[in-house]
Interface confidence: low
């Protein structure tokens, strides 16, 4: 069964800056990755970045840099802005659309015990939805 993992890290040098890393553990071909915050995309969350293997990368503030790390993983740097920046319990979700597996999504947030700059290893997060 395909899985999606999500890792959230707060940068030590800039406490309102987050790095989100997501990966797809499956054999299919990825056609689209959507990163959102505040809940799953389409369920109260809002899109931060869309990564398409051919059409390119689209991002919205406070996303500062979205990029492919490998053919099946991406990373996104978020830049916070004072009171309205992401906080430690903000939920980030990644949705991978792949063929033939379909759409798989998982969410994660900063581990509660994390010190800035530290994070748990990128273990698979619970899969919220498979379309």
């Amino acid at each position: 069964t395909p899985e999606v993992w999500v890792q959230v890290r707060m940068e030590a040098t800039e406490l309102s800056s987050f790095t989100i890393r997501c990966g797809f553990l499956g054999s299919g071909s990825i056609s689209l990755v959507t990163v959102s915050w505040g809940g799953p995309n389409g369920a109260g969350g809002t899109t931060l970045a869309v990564l398409h293997p051919e059409r390119g990368i689209r991002q919205w503030a406070p996303a500062r840099q979205a990029r492919w790390e490998t053919q099946s993983s991406i990373s996104l740097i978020l830049e916070g802005s004072g009171a309205s920046s992401p906080c430690a319990n903000t939920t980030f979700c990644c949705k991978f659309a792949s063929f033939p597996e379909g759409s798989w999504e998982a969410c994660g947030s900063l581990p509660p015990s994390s010190d800035p700059g530290l994070s748990a290893p990128p273990t698979p997060a619970p899969i919220l939805r498979a379309d």
Epitope: T46, A61, P62
Partner: antibody
Framework: EVQLQQSGPELVKPGASVRITCKAS????????IHWVKQSHGKSLEWIGY????????GYNQKFKSQATLTVDTSSTTAYMEIRSLTSEDSAVYYC?????????????WGQGTSVTVSS | DIQMTQSPASLSVSVGETVNITCRVS??????LAWYQQKQGKSPQLLVY???NLPDGVPSRFSGSGSGTQYSLKINTLQSEDFGTYYC?????????FGGGTKLEIK
């Protein structure tokens, strides 16, 4: 009827701060981003930033990030923009506008504008 | 940041003529572009979104087209109420910059 009602004109001294309000009505406040746009006299439009009322998420034009702060009060469906350390360069009309979140990206309704004059 | 270059900066035309305004973008924005009309002393109003879609209430004499880095707004059979300043704006990653504007004046 969708309305974005902005606060009245402001005359402020250099170095001071100003807070502009944008009261939204006629739609679900948390379904739309609120954007702020600056227009200096006789000039083009400059995008300042936006705020997402659902979770307070915001994005700024780097040019304005250190000077402007965007906030919302969902209970009163009001968006606010505070601008600090004002100079004559900040004299302009400021607009709020809404954008349906990640749908048809465009600013489909605008406030009437708030004129800010910075003068000693 | 993405740069938006609008042309012409101003245009003097007569009622009944057809007008084309162009917006050149510094990189591919995949049709994520809006056009606005602003009349003197008023707020901008949305004319076109997604490069070619008209919101409800916008007259069909307005049309938007383009893709990649080149977009245009066409006004057929210009009416007296069409005079004003027109702006393009991209929505391909922040900041969502505007073009410099095209002022449409009566000849």
């Amino acid at each position: 009827e969708v309305q974005l009602q902005q606060s009245g004109p402001e005359l402020v001294k250099p170095g001071a701060s100003v807070r502009i309000t944008c009261k939204a009505s006629g739609y679900t406040f948390t379904d739309y981003n609120i954007h702020w746009v600056k227009q200096s006299h006789g000039k083009s439009l400059e995008w300042i930033g936006y705020i997402y009322p659902y979770n307070g998420g915001s994005g700024y034009n780097q040019k304005f990030k250190s000077q402007a702060t965007l906030t919302v009060d969902t209970s009163s469906t009001t968006a606010y923009m505070e601008i600090r350390s004002l100079t004559s360069e900040d004299s302009a009309v400021y607009y709020c506008a809404r954008e349906e979140v990640r749908r048809d990206e465009a600013l489909d309704f605008w406030g009437q504008g708030t004129s800010v004059t910075v003068s000693s | 940041d993405i740069q938006m270059t609008q042309s012409p900066a101003s245009l003097s035309v007569s009622v009944g003529e057809t007008v084309n305004i162009t917006c050149r973008v510094s990189e591919n924005i995949y049709s994520n572009l809006a056009w606005y009309q602003q009349k003197q002393g008023k707020s901008p109003q949305l004319l076109v979104y997604g490069a070619s879609n008209l919101p409800d209430g916008v007259p069909s004499r307005f049309s938007g087209s383009g893709s990649g880095t080149q977009y245009s707004l066409k006004i057929n059979t210009l009416q007296s109420e069409d005079f004003g300043t027109y702006y393009c704006q991209h929505f391909w990653g922040t900041p969502y910059t505007f073009g410099g504007g095209t002022k449409l004046e009566i000849k």
